[in-house]
């Protein structure tokens, strides 16, 4: 019962997480204009992974897609890639986990197969969550770098032609949605992996096996010893899992570069 609950909860948490990752990826507010000196603005800029928008005080909003692919910063491309990989892995994980759910009966699928599928989906969710967290973190790092760069060059001219106040951008809502969603997907994945251990059929090995020694007839019951030490042929049916431990290095952010009213 606890295993089913853990698996079900892991699925639901991952589902919410992946929905959040998709939402974050589609959102326009990855970076929003920093209102450092003017909290009420007549023109407000914000940017997403796919387009940039300008909202006027009049209420009109104009969004323009990034129609170039080669002209975009490499870091933005990397963030896009990480988020898409996260979504794809998460979607596959969801598909796999649906069939792995203990409460769903599909033909004569054995528990061992369900356990394998649960583990697979769990790992997929973990990697999906890490991709999302990494993507959002890279973008955030990019913003921080640019924020201080634009602060240093606050009143630089554009090629000496036009004196323009450089727009500074700060964290948008999508970053927080992405971090939370990535975290939820990660937690859901860990829960699936934990559930997998409970789903795995553990051989009891308490059937008496007769070994005929020369001149003697002695019955041994070796299951407990073999199960605990890992010796013997029965170990192939024993699921050994490390709990999906991962190092913090997989979520490191990288130095980057990126760009109110």
């Amino acid at each position: 019962m606890a295993v089913t609950a853990c698996q079900g909860l892991g699925f639901v948490v991952s589902l919410i997480g992946i929905a959040g990752i998709i939402a974050a990826t589609c959102m326009d507010q990855w970076s929003t204009q920093d209102l450092y000196n003017n909290p009420v603005t007549a023109v407000f800029n914000y940017q997403g992974l796919w387009r940039s928008c300008v909202r006027e005080s009049s209420g009109f909003t104009e969004c323009r897609g990034y129609f170039t692919l080669l002209g975009l910063p490499a870091m933005l491309q990397a963030v896009r890639a990480l988020m898409i990989v996260g979504i794809v892995l998460g979607a596959i994980g969801l598909l796999v986990s649906i069939f792995a759910l203990k409460c769903i009966r599909i033909g004569s699928m054995e528990d061992s197969a369900k356990a394998n599928m649960t583990l697979t989906s769990g790992i997929m969710f973990i990697v999906s969550g890490l991709c999302a967290i990494a993507g959002v973190s890279v973008f955030a790092n990019m913003l921080v770098t640019n924020f201080w760069m634009s602060t240093a060059n606050m009143y630089t001219g554009m090629g000496g032609m036009v004196q323009t106040v450089q727009t500074r951008y700060t964290f948008g809502a999508a970053l927080f949605v992405g971090w939370v969603a990535g975290g939820l997907t990660l937690i859901g994945g860990v829960m699936m992996c934990i559930a997998c251990r409970g789903l795995a059929p553990e051989e009891t090995n308490y059937k008496a096996v007769s070994y005929h020694a020369s001149g003697h007839s002695v019955a041994y019951k070796p299951g407990g010893f073999k199960a605990s030490t890992g010796f013997g042929s029965n170990t192939k049916n024993k699921k050994i899992y490390d709990g999906g431990a991962r190092t913090e290095d997989e979520v490191q952010s990288y130095p980057s570069k990126h760009d109110y009213v």
């Epitope: 800029n45 300008v54 009049s58 209420g59 323009r64």
Partner: antibody, heavy 118, light 113 residues
Framework: QVQLVQSGAEVKKPGASVKVSCKAS????????MNWVKQAPGQGLEWIGN????????SYNQKFKGRVTLTIDKSTSTVYMELSSLRSEDTAVYYC???????????WGQGTTVTVSS | DIVMTQSPDSLAVSLGERATINCKSS????????????LTWYQQKPGQPPKLLIY???TRKSGVPDRFSGSGSGTDFTLTISSLQAEDVAVYYC?????????FGGGTKVEIK
Amino acid sequence: QVQLVQSGAEVKKPGASVKVSCKASGYSFTGYNMNWVKQAPGQGLEWIGNIDPYYGGTSYNQKFKGRVTLTIDKSTSTVYMELSSLRSEDTAVYYCARMYHGNAFDYWGQGTTVTVSS
Amino acid sequence: DIVMTQSPDSLAVSLGERATINCKSSQSLLNSGNLKNYLTWYQQKPGQPPKLLIYWASTRKSGVPDRFSGSGSGTDFTLTISSLQAEDVAVYYCQNDYSYPLTFGGGTKVEIK
């Protein structure tokens, strides 16, 4: 067609308050911000503030803040500007104007003359 | 606050001639998000409310004659009336629509020589 009809002229004593109305018609009232502009006799234009009829959010010129209050009545598509603690320099024509693309004012009311005199 | 400075204060031009009004802002009105200049031009005739001519520095409002054109970017802007007509006698104002408080220039009075 878009129309902004303002209330009639007002004569007030110093220290009093005045409430000018601006009734909008011919467009979706909540879809456009409404602004108020002051024009003193023989002078230029001065922005007072604006109100978002959808959310009710307001922005004011610091010069008028504390003395001016912008309100709306969605049921009658009317915007109100109340100016308190009137002084002689408040004598002017007050216009309401609809905000358009580029934050420009595309339609204006006919203006309301407010005279402050003792 | 952004200060808008118009020049000249008044302008006398012969009918059919070109009239040029300048407007300078104390800060750039160019928005980096959409590369548009948030500057508007209005025409005001005596006893009437102002009338919108040009927004985004160079976009003519529908119905405005094409003899009116706006140009400039950043801090320096120009309103040009290519061939002055009698009905163009008015006061012309530029406005900062980029940053609150929204501010107007002092106005330029256009007359017929």
